[in-house]
């Protein structure tokens, strides 16, 4: 899959899980760098991926809510990310400065199911996103005007 950032260092990847969706995220940020990421698969937190340290932000997805697009910002290391969801919310981690790229699936209806990349002592050197169809597809019209986000204004 496509990787964003200059690369280098040790590889990391979330656990491949065919039975659970991503239901939450923890992102640790310190010294203007994204240090690590951790996904919640169903009810359980997967292993923390990346470097040590930083302050951790945690977000919880609502039932039936998925991450559908990600912006990433690099300056030698991953500086920030914005994750957009299927319920018109977004979550902001770190700072969106430097080289900004957007990541989204090639197939309509696919959602984020995994994260992979490379890290060094100071932080994440590259990151990639695995997209796939959700286990249970939504069967109703899209939601209208959901108005709150955990830590930022609504938008997509």
């Amino acid at each position: 899959g496509k990787m964003y950032g200059p690369g280098g260092g040790k590889y990391f990847s979330t656990t491949e899980d065919y039975d659970h969706e991503i239901t939450g995220l923890r992102v640790s940020v310190g010294l203007l760098l994204v240090k690590s990421v951790q996904v919640k698969l169903g009810d359980s937190w997967d292993v923390k991926l990346g470097a040590l340290g930083g302050n951790t932000q945690e977000v919880t997805l609502q039932p039936g809510e998925y991450i559908t697009k990600v912006f990433v910002a690099f300056q030698a290391f991953l500086r920030g990310m914005v994750m957009y969801t299927s319920k018109d919310r977004y979550f902001y981690f770190g700072k969106l400065d430097g080289q900004i790229s957007s990541a989204y699936p090639s197939q309509e209806g696919q959602v984020l199911v995994g994260i992979y990349g490379q890290y060094q002592l100071l932080g994440i050197k590259s990151i990639g996103f695995e997209w796939n169809y959700p286990l249970e597809e939504p069967t109703t019209e899209p939601p209208v005007n959901l108005t709150y986000s955990a830590n930022s204004p609504v938008g997509r």
């Epitope: 090639s106 197939q107 209806g109 597809e137 109703t140 899209p142 997509r156």
Partner: antibody, heavy 121, light 112 residues
């Protein structure tokens, strides 16, 4: 009810460009990707690409990369497909299509009426 | 790219008889995560846009008569019209939504 209404037939010369429009009604255009599919006379269906009208993200079939541009104007609920450097084998009916509401996968349940583009010198 | 190959190219069937169309993909359309086959069937009549009949290989779209059924998994799929009616004369296409979107070349169904 859901409707996709396309612009009228076009006749173009080789090397020219054509821009086909698809006006959506009965739903919010921002909630669904718009796909474009073409069909040469007496031939099969060929997927060209999609645009997400919410943010303008696009994904084009490899065959059309560099020649096709998909855009949208959400204020008038309209998607556009522009094909440049036209050749005679681009003569086809061009359709816009939208998925069903029953699943998020791109099963094309709603189609425009088609726009015939004829490329001839 | 995934290549979709239909057989036969054309088919003549008597009214009330069974019509069977095959579709083969160059790679499996079974998604190991969702355990679904990302294959659809469309019907196209002359001068009209295609109409969605079946998706996920076997799920009938709302309003589609139950004489239409889909089966198969992985790389081999079948559309069956159990009792051909005059209004079923059309070209039928399979389409994969596993990796981007590709249609088969079409199968023309006529009355014998």
């Amino acid at each position: 009810q859901v409707q996709l209404v396309q612009s009228g037939a076009e006749v173009k010369k080789p090397g020219a460009s054509v821009k086909v429009s698809c006006k959506a009604s009965g739903f919010n255009i921002k909630d669904y990707y718009m796909h474009w599919v073409r069909q040469a006379p007496g031939q099969g269906l060929e997927w060209m690409g999609w645009i997400d009208p919410e943010n303008g993200n696009t994904n084009y079939a490899q065959k059309f990369q560099g020649r096709v541009t998909m855009t949208r104007d959400t204020s008038i609920s309209t998607a556009y497909m522009e094909l440049s450097r036209l050749r005679s084998d681009d003569t086809a009916v061009y359709y816009c299509a939208r998925r069903a509401i029953t699943t998020a996968t791109a099963w094309f349940a709603y189609w425009g009426q088609g726009t015939l583009v004829t490329v001839s010198s | 790219d995934i290549v979709m190959t239909q057989s036969p190219d054309s088919l003549a069937v008597s009214l009330g008889e069974r019509a069977t169309i095959n579709c083969k993909s160059s790679q499996s359309l079974l998604n190991s995560r969702t355990r679904k086959n990302y294959l659809a069937w469309y019907q196209q009549k002359p001068g009209q846009p295609p109409k969605l009949l079946i998706y996920w290989a076997s799920t009938r779209e709302s309003g589609v008569p139950d004489r239409f059924s889909g089966s198969g998994s992985g790389t081999d799929f079948t559309l069956t019209i159990s009792s051909l009616q005059a209004e079923d004369v059309a070209v039928y296409y399979c389409k994969q939504s596993y990796n981007l979107y590709t249609f088969g070349q079409g199968t023309k169904v006529e009355i014998k």
